[in-house]
Interface confidence: medium
């Protein structure tokens, strides 16, 4: 597969209410189960149909979960992370990292599993700057007419 895959990385706080069958998603990851190379973080691998997460609609497959009820998920064994979710109570607050694909180019390949991405400001700032330069140039051109 050729081409570079770039991502906008955004974070979101998602508050879920545990449903009759729980929170309704699966996870992979942990210090003993690094699925993403060089990253022992916890990732959402399945959203179960009609579960609490699916009905809420914000959590997506591939999201990285940074914390549960304020507790950081860094450097946890896989089963310890699972237990943290299972013991999280009725109302569960998740801090999650979404990755939105923004570009496919022919310059190498980042790899689908690589969690690194482009912060949103790194895309928006150059776009804003270009827009301002174009507007300035247009105004100068109109003045010359």
């Amino acid at each position: 597969m050729n081409g570079r895959v770039d991502y906008l990385v955004t974070e979101e706080e998602i508050n879920l209410t545990r449903g009759p069958s729980g929170l309704g998603f699966n996870i992979v990851g942990g210090t003993d189960q690094q699925y993403v190379s060089n990253d022992s973080g916890i990732y959402v691998s399945r959203i179960k149909e009609n579960g609490a997460a699916a009905l809420d609609g914000r959590l997506q497959e591939g999201d990285k979960i940074l914390s549960v009820n304020g507790q950081d998920l860094k450097n946890l064994l896989h089963q310890d992370a699972v237990d943290l979710f299972r013991n999280a109570g009725y109302a569960v607050s998740l801090r999650v990292q979404h990755r939105l694909q923004v570009q496919n180019g022919p310059i190498g390949h980042r790899g689908e599993g690589d969690p690194s991405g482009i912060p949103i400001f790194m895309v928006l700032v150059p776009v804003f700057a270009l827009t301002m330069v174009a507007a300035w140039a247009f105004m100068r051109y109109r003045q010359q007419l």
């Epitope: 729980g22 996870i27 992979v28 497959e61 089963q79 979710f85 299972r86 689908e112």
Partner: nanobody, 131 residues
């Protein structure tokens, strides 16, 4: 997120062998290795039934009693492909065989058996006829 295409079906004599393949096209930003994969079959006039499954990591496999000892499920994550090798085929193995996928990993709610739960994505099926 996942499109599945099965191949390898056909007409085979009783006692023969077949290898079914299922190639997955995974949405960008996802990886095939995150999905549990399964094979199901549906004979004419019967309900679709579980045949075999393999966990997302490949570390666990599950088989229906009807095919245990005669079939082997395997996966090649580099090729986005899951296989079902079927040996000593019987006329009662005649069916449309479907490949299925669902996100793997561990449920944050409760432990479960890969072979027993509903799957999220399905292929169109490949016909296997044992004469």
């Amino acid at each position: 997120h996942v499109q599945l295409v099965e191949s390898g079906g056909g007409l085979v004599q009783a006692g023969g062998s077949l290898r079914l393949s299922c190639v997955a096209s995974v949405a960008s930003g996802r990886t095939f290795g995150w999905y549990d994969m399964g094979w199901f079959r549906q004979a004419p006039g019967k309900e679709r039934e579980f045949v075999a499954a393999i966990s997302w990591s490949g570390g666990s496999t599950y088989y229906a009693d009807s095919v245990k000892g005669r079939s082997t499920i395997s996966r090649d994550n580099a090729k986005n492909t899951v296989y079902l090798q079927m040996n000593s085929l019987k006329p009662e193995d005649t069916a449309v065989y479907y490949c299925a996928a669902r996100g793997g990993g561990t449920s944050v709610d409760s432990d479960y058996d890969v072979g027993e739960f509903e799957y999220d994505y399905w292929g169109q099926g490949t016909q296997v006829t044992v004469s």
